[in-house]
């Protein structure tokens, strides 16, 4: 999977969208998990409603919400009041039994609030060192790695 980078501003909300084939994933619940390193396990953060037909209902776990447009084939995750520790690698998953298919790998980056001068030294500003080499900008808040491109990481 390519990794798509979503950038959000500290203190604000960030919306992550994961498109998928609605027919292929018909009847499947979805989940959002945080990956512990590029090769590490993915820890479940939040999943859609236990009843697939009610997947459109927003479910929260702390400051993270998930909702699924099962007809349109778009899973949407909202990270409210984004904080530096929210940065990291995540996955959108489609669940079937005890298995999970990856719909999208997502790197969340937290940018400094340009209006918050108190913590300006503590957060990353776009245009400085980037986590990924040669990643092209998809749109204002996300970009994808090129095919076969390796994250030019962080480490642990």
């Amino acid at each position: 999977h390519n990794t798509t980078v979503f950038q959000g501003v500290a203190g604000q909300s960030l919306q992550v969208s994961c498109p998928y084939d609605s027919m292929k994933h018909w009847g499947r619940r979805k989940a959002w998990c945080r990956q512990l390193g590029e090769k590490g396990p993915c820890q479940r953060v939040v999943s859609t409603h236990n009843l697939w037909l009610l997947s459109f209902l927003r479910r929260w776990n702390g400051s993270t919400a998930i909702t699924d447009d099962t007809l349109g084939g778009t899973l949407t995750i909202t990270l409210r009041n984004l904080q530096p520790h929210d940065a990291g690698l995540y996955q959108c998953q489609s669940l079937h039994g005890s298995e999970a298919d990856t719909l999208r790998k997502v790197l969340v980056e937290v940018l400094a609030d340009p209006l918050d001068h108190r913590d300006a030294g503590d957060l990353w500003f776009p245009g400085e060192s980037e986590s990924f080499e040669d990643a092209h900008v998809e749109h204002s808040i996300s970009r994808s790695l090129l095919e076969g491109e390796i994250p030019f990481p962080p480490t642990s």
Epitope: R34, Q35, L36, G37, E38, K39, G40, P84, H85, A87, G88, L89, L107, E109, V110, L123, W124, F125, E128, S129, E130, S131, I150, P151, F152, P153, P154, T155, S156
Partner: antibody, heavy 120, light 107 residues
Framework: QVQLVQSGAEVKKPGASVKVSCKAS????????IHWVRQAPGQGLEWMGW????????KYAPKFQGRVTITADTSTSTAYMELSSLRSEDTAVYYC?????????????WGQGTLVTVSS | DIQMTQSPSSLSASVGDRVTITCHAS??????LSWYQQKPGKAPKLLIY???NLHTGVPSRFSGSGSGTDFTLTISSLQPEDFATYYC?????????FGQGTKVEIK
């Protein structure tokens, strides 16, 4: 139990090459990235490079580019670091280090270290 | 390369003292910072990952904080086994780089 076991100490002449091995047990190296870090006597830690044993992709610190080669043999769960054109400043303890990569790896294993002495 | 600067380079403290070590990155590294402890003749041990997360098995007297360019490792009550050298390491980009180390000695 999970561990990384490195090859024994080496004494080399300037200009020679050295190849240090790092054998993993208790886990599969394909599931990890293997890094090499060195430490000269009385000095700090210095990252040399990294390999993804799953696909053989490697990346090196600019300082060592062209002199270091990191390889891995998944059939024996062993990683190797070869350093060429040795000079006295390369005298150091060389460590292999396994983790799950960037973005919050919670796995972190180190070899016991291999002392490489470069002396004429 | 991203430069990592630790301070102080060494400190003397007594058992029970609160010890703080700082690490400054030359560029923003988000929260991608780890802290390692190393004792003479031994390999480094991971204490903290992602700036503030305690690694498995590490005593709770160790804590990390910070994001962006400035980070702190705190030992709330120094124990005899904590006398060692501590290193920060950035994981924002390759090459990974370490601070020069802070040696914590017995006063």
């Amino acid at each position: 139990q999970v561990q990384l076991v490195q090859s024994g100490a080496e004494v080399k002449k300037p200009g020679a090459s050295v190849k240090v091995s790092c054998k993993a047990s208790g886990f599969s190296i394909e599931d990890f990235y293997i890094h090499w870090v060195r430490q000269a006597p009385g000095q700090g830690l210095e990252w040399m490079g990294w390999i993804d044993p799953e696909n053989g992709e490697s990346k090196y610190a600019p300082k060592f580019q062209g002199r270091v080669t990191i390889t891995a043999d998944t059939s024996t769960s062993t990683a190797y670091m070869e350093l060429s054109s040795l000079r006295s400043e390369d005298t150091a303890v060389y460590y292999c280090h396994a983790d799950h990569g960037n973005y919050g790896s919670t796995m972190d294993y180190w070899g016991q270290g291999t002392l490489v002495t470069v002396s004429s | 390369d991203i430069q990592m600067t630790q301070s102080p380079s060494s400190l003397s403290a007594s058992v029970g003292d609160r010890v703080t070590i700082t690490c400054h990155a030359s560029q923003h590294i988000n929260v991608w910072l780890s802290w390692y402890q190393q004792k003479p003749g031994k390999a480094p041990k991971l204490l903290i990952y992602k700036a503030s997360n305690l690694h498995t098995g590490v005593p709770s007297r160790f804590s990390g904080s910070g994001s962006g360019t400035d980070f702190t490792l705190t030992i709330s009550s120094l124990q005899p086994e904590d006398f060692a050298t501590y290193y920060c390491q950035q994981g924002q980009t390759y090459p990974r780089t370490f601070g020069q180390g802070t040696k914590v000695e017995i006063k």
